[in-house]
């Protein structure tokens, strides 16, 4: 029961996390104009991974996509890649984990297969969460660097009477959504890995010993296994979990999504 709850909770937490990663990736407010000395501004700038926007005090908002690919900073491209990898891995992980859920019956899938799939999805969620956290952190670092550079530029003399307004950018809402979502996905992944251990209890492999009693044909097995009638019908303990050494068709047959990254 606890295993099912852990697995189910891990799935739900990861689902919320991945939804958050997708939301953060699509959001326009990765960086927002710093209102350090003017809390009410007539023109407010904010930027996302895919477009930059300007909101005027008139209520008019204009967004422009980054239509160039080569002209964009390498760091931005890296952040995009990390977020997309995170989403793709998370999506595959969700797909795998649905089939791995203990509460869902699919044909005659053995617990060992479910354990394998639970572990696979858990690892995918962990990597997905780490990708999101890394992506958001790289962007945040880029913002901090640019912030202090623009601050330095603001206080260096222009030489003339004319002042130039330097727009500084600070952390946008998407960064916090991304950090939280990445963390949730990571936690969900860890929970799936914990659940996987519960799905595959460690067993001692003893050779079954048959005791022949007169008039009865009963095979006694150590380890609390049920006795089964008949000679040699179930004389070997089945391995429930083999530490992921098997190549399960269910796991391996998913199409590779790395072409999209």
């Amino acid at each position: 029961m606890a295993v099912t709850a852990c697995q189910g909770l891990g799935f739900v937490v990861s689902l919320i996390g991945i939804a958050g990663i997708i939301a953060a990736t699509c959001m326009d407010q990765w960086s927002t104009q710093d209102l350090y000395n003017n809390p009410v501004t007539a023109v407010f700038n904010y930027q996302g991974l895919w477009r930059s926007c300007v909101r005027e005090s008139s209520g008019f908002t204009e967004c422009r996509g980054y239509f160039t690919l080569l002209g964009l900073p390498a760091m931005l491209q890296a952040v995009r890649a990390l977020m997309i990898v995170g989403i793709v891995l998370g999506a595959i992980g969700l797909l795998v984990s649905i089939f791995a859920l203990k509460c869902i019956r699919i044909g005659s899938m053995e617990d060992s297969a479910k354990a394998n799939m639970t572990l696979t999805s858990g690892i995918m969620f962990i990597v997905s969460g780490l990708c999101a956290i890394a992506g958001v952190s790289v962007f945040a670092n880029m913002l901090v660097t640019n912030f202090w550079m623009s601050t330095a530029n603001m206080y260096t003399g222009m030489g003339g009477m004319v002042q130039t307004v330097q727009t500084r950018y600070t952390f946008g809402a998407a960064l916090f959504v991304g950090w939280v979502a990445g963390g949730l996905t990571l936690i969900g992944g860890v929970m799936m890995c914990i659940a996987c251990r519960g799905l595959a209890p460690e067993e001692t492999n003893y050779k079954a010993v048959s005791y022949h009693a007169s008039g009865h044909s009963v095979a006694y097995k150590p380890g609390g296994f049920k006795a089964s009638t008949g000679f040699g019908s179930n004389t070997k303990n089945k391995k429930i979990y083999d530490g992921g050494a098997r190549t399960e068709d269910e796991v391996q047959s998913y199409p590779s999504k790395h072409d999209y990254v």
Epitope: N45, G59, R64, T164, V165
Partner: antibody, heavy 115, light 113 residues
Framework: EVQLVESGGGLVQPGGSLRLSCAVS?????MNWVRQAPGKGLEWVAW????????TYADDFKGRFTISRDDSKNTLYLQMNSLRAEDTAVYYC???????????WGQGTLVTVSS | DIQMTQSPSSLSASVGDRVTITCKSS????????????LTWYQQKPGKAPKLLIY???TLESGVPSRFSGSGSGTDYTLTISSLQPEDFATYYC?????????FGQGTKVEIK
Amino acid sequence: EVQLVESGGGLVQPGGSLRLSCAVSGYTFSMNWVRQAPGKGLEWVAWINMYTGEPTYADDFKGRFTISRDDSKNTLYLQMNSLRAEDTAVYYCARLVRGNGMDYWGQGTLVTVSS
Amino acid sequence: DIQMTQSPSSLSASVGDRVTITCKSSQSLLNSGNQKSYLTWYQQKPGKAPKLLIYWASTLESGVPSRFSGSGSGTDYTLTISSLQPEDFATYYCQNAYSFPFTFGQGTKVEIK
């Protein structure tokens, strides 16, 4: 079609108060009050976001003037306190549009501060 | 606050003349986010409310004749009337629309010569 109609202007003594109204019909996201002293240029007074009620003022009017709106009546207000002779002007309400330009203006209401 | 300085303060011209009014701001009105200059031009006739002519320094408001044009970037802006018409005799104002408080130029009065 947007229409802006101001009212509430008149003669007031120095130190007195007055509340100007601007009846708004049609879509407005944000509004301004702009004034013009006789024979002088335009002077921006205040701005308000008609949805959130967030205001901002020119430095000369902070503390003395209050811009507000009444959603139910679709009306914009300018509460003017501690009036001075130099506040004598025609007061206009104007709608802010794309590019932060003011496209629709009221007909203006004259406020005269004199003893 | 951003100061707006218009020149000339008044000018005399004849119908059909090309008229140029300049406006200088104490700070750049160019927004880096969309590369647009937040400068607005208005026309005002005596006893009437101002009329919006141009926003974003060069975008003509709908219904405004094409003889009006705006140009400039950063701190220097120009309003040009290519062929002055009798109805164009009025006072013209430029406005900082980039940051609060919004500020207007002192105005340029265009009179009949």
